[in-house]
Interface confidence: low
């Protein structure tokens, strides 16, 4: 099937980084500057993504792959492929419609992005608060007072939560 297709369609021989140029009798021409083709057999090359403004270039465009952007310092990526950049806040804050705001009492944010989350309720697991929470840090739960014996201590910090609306890059 592949061989038949090649005989019928000369464009299928054009490798990535080139395009099948109808204006030149279907010759494989290299992609022009600032464009790319990531697969073979393409009749056009795609325009490279430009990382402008608050975006900065993480990976340059090549003839076979698009540029990749991330965000300038003070901003972080949102969406698949870093489609948007959003302002960072300080730890202990969250971004609202009115800008960065401190976490309310009883909540924390240990990152520069995302929302403030409630402190862990140690008593739900029958544990006691070993270290109090702050705006930047969750509480640390320890064994219940009854379990504490001299020299024994088991402190398990809570697992970090993933960010809302943030797709892994």
């Amino acid at each position: 099937f592949e061989r038949t297709r090649s005989l019928q369609d000369p464009c299928s021989n054009c490798p990535a980084g080139t395009f099948c140029d109808n204006n030149r009798n279907q010759i494989c021409s290299p992609c022009p500057p600032n464009s790319f083709s990531s697969a073979g057999g393409q009749r056009t090359c795609d325009i490279c993504r430009q990382c402008k403004g608050v975006f900065r270039t993480r990976k340059e465009c090549s003839s076979t792959s698009n540029a990749e952007c991330d965000c300038t310092p003070g901003f972080h990526c949102l969406g698949a492929g870093c489609s948007m950049c959003e302002q960072d806040c300080k730890q202990g804050q969250e971004l609202t419609k009115k800008g960065c705001k401190d976490c309310c009492f009883g909540t924390f944010n240990d990152q520069k992005r995302g929302i403030c989350r409630p402190w862990t309720n140690c008593s739900l697991d029958g544990k006691s608060v070993l270290v109090n929470g702050t705006k930047e840090r969750d509480v640390v739960c320890g064994p219940s007072p009854a379990d504490l014996s001299p020299g024994a201590s088991s402190v398990t910090p809570p697992a970090p939560a993933r960010e809302p609306g943030h797709s892994p890059q």
């Epitope: 402008k52 403004g53 698949a80 959003e86 609202t96 995302g114 929302i115 809302p164 609306g165």
Partner: antibody, heavy 123, light 107 residues
């Protein structure tokens, strides 16, 4: 006052393409922290998100379902966005909305919507 | 994609009634949920964002609550203009998704 006005809907043949416009007023498409999404609603059905553009930089993201046959673009000088959808089938019959998207704190919510434009795919 | 399931699909109520609509997410979405109202032939209108924040200009009889996977929209005293379809939407994970809608009809 923020306003979004869609246009370009109508009857389209199966296999054809549509190009819808969304003219924005009352805010600039180059404002940081604002993006615009296209969302559709088939007759009597729920809302379905198609994709988003950050007009400030032209970056787009599309729902997996539409990947490969959708393009969202913008012309900031006209404060207008566009939705191009190719290889149309009967299931693409819907009212198409553009909606402003205020993203902050990692959340995407649609605070202003256009009135919608109806696209009917039929032979 | 994260699925949102609303219940009930429709309900009949009278003016002055307290109405509660629930939205359940297929996985934890923290508080990244919004509620919209849609009237026939009109575009949806944002009522609540971040699960419990009232959008500017929305009457205080609307309220939202919940976190994790279970969310509620409450209309404390139903008014004639509240008869409409209501949708929840999550923005915790990509892509944003909507519930199937709850139609509030006049009894």
């Amino acid at each position: 006052e923020v306003q979004l006005v869609e246009s370009g809907g109508g009857l389209v043949q199966p296999g054809g393409s549509l190009r819808l416009s969304c003219a924005a007023s009352g805010f600039s498409l180059s404002t940081s922290g604002v993006a615009v999404s296209w969302i559709r609603q088939a007759p009597g059905k729920g809302l379905e998100w198609i994709g988003i553009i950050n007009p400030n930089f032209g970056d787009t993201n599309y729902a997996q379902k539409f990947q490969g046959r959708v393009t969202i673009s913008r012309d900031n000088s006209k404060n207008t966005l566009y939705l191009q959808l190719n290889s149309l089938r009967a299931e693409d019959t819907a009212v198409y909305y553009c909606a402003r998207d205020e993203y902050y704190g990692g959340s995407y919510y649609f605070d202003y919507w256009g009135q919608g434009t109806l696209v009917t795919v039929s032979s | 994609d994260i699925q949102l399931t609303q219940s009930p699909s429709s309900l009949s109520a009278s003016v002055g009634d307290r109405v509660t609509i629930t939205c359940r997410a297929s996985q934890d979405v923290r508080t990244a949920v919004a509620w919209y109202q849609q009237k026939p032939g009109k575009a949806p209108k944002l009522l609540i964002y971040d699960a419990s924040n009232l959008e500017t200009g929305v009457p205080s009889r609307f309220s939202g609550s919940g976190s994790g996977t279970d969310f509620t929209l409450t209309i404390s005293s139903l008014q004639p203009e509240d008869f409409a379809t209501y949708y929840c939407q999550q923005s915790y994970d990509w892509p944003p998704t909507f519930g199937q809608g709850t139609k509030v009809e006049i009894k």
